[in-house]
């Protein structure tokens, strides 16, 4: 069964800066990745970035530097200040559309006890949804 993992890390140098990494553990080819915050897309979440292997990348503030890390994982930096800044309990979700598996989504947030600069290892997040 395919899985999606989400890792959220707060940067030690900037406490309002977060790095989100997501990956797809499956054999299919990825056709689209959507990153959102505040919950899943379509369920009260806000699209932060969309990444397509051929058509490129779009991102919306406070997202910066969305990029492919590998063919099956992506990363994204959030630089926030004021109202647009993410907080420690913000939920981030990644949805991977792949062929032939379909769409798989997982969400994660900063581990509650983590210090800046530290993060939990990238494990499959508890919220998992297949369309």
């Amino acid at each position: 069964t395919p899985e999606v993992w989400v890792q959220v890390r707060m940067e030690a140098t900037e406490l309002s800066s977060f790095t989100i990494r997501c990956g797809f553990l499956g054999s299919g080819s990825i056709s689209l990745v959507t990153v959102s915050w505040g919950g899943p897309n379509g369920a009260g979440g806000t699209t932060l970035a969309v990444l397509h292997p051929e058509r490129g990348i779009r991102q919306w503030a406070p997202a910066r530097q969305a990029r492919w890390e590998t063919q099956s994982s992506i990363s994204l930096i959030l630089e926030g200040s004021g109202a647009s800044s993410p907080c420690a309990n913000t939920t981030f979700c990644c949805k991977f559309a792949s062929f032939p598996e379909g769409s798989w989504e997982a969400c994660g947030s900063l581990p509650p006890s983590s210090d800046p600069g530290l993060s939990a290892p990238p494990t499959p997040a508890p919220i998992l949804r297949a369309d």
């Epitope: 505040g38 897309n41 009260g44 699209t47 397509h52 058509r55 919306w60």
Partner: antibody, heavy 119, light 106 residues
Amino acid sequence: QVQLQQSGPELVKPGASVKISCRSSGYTFTDYYINWVKQRPGQGLEWIGWIFPGSDYTYYNEKFKGKATLTVDKSSTTAYMLLSSLTSEDSAVYFCARDGGLRGPFDYWGQGTTLTVSS
Amino acid sequence: DIQMTQSPSSLSASLGGKVTITCKASQDINKYIAWYQQKPGKGPRLLIHYTSTLQPGIPSRFSGSGSGRNSSFSISNLEPEDIATYYCLQYDNLHTFGGGTKLEIK
């Protein structure tokens, strides 16, 4: 087909407020950012801000913070822009525009709403 | 904030000819530039995004290129319906429009 239909022209007095609407059809309203753009007579285009209808998340151009307030009504797939404390500098045509994501920014536009501020 | 300097502000060209408009950003915009056509009394129309990607239904007479801070937009084989004002837009970091270029036919 995708359409954005804006409300009609407005003539208002200085100091008053006005609410402009932009009704979307032909796509999933909650999946795409709606942007607002100002164009003064004979001038260029200025980005005011955006709202993501799926979550009500807003982001404003610093210049328009306190001047514009963006909201949506999901049930009617309509975006609104409230402009307050109006002066003659606010007289302009205001456009709403959908951000198409990978299809391109501002890929569909409303027809524009003309606002005239005059006593 | 990223500033966009668009030039020229106006130009005149002959039917069948070619024109080129340039936009210079105050910093690298990673190819995130779009070009719009606006006719009097109408909303703008997206022609090109991501520097050179033509929107569906837009004739191949329109083209875009560039990298880093510099971008250009060209129309070849000018036709009467190309009379309009053209704007660039950077969307790498929020949104900033260029000042516009008014195209007239000689």
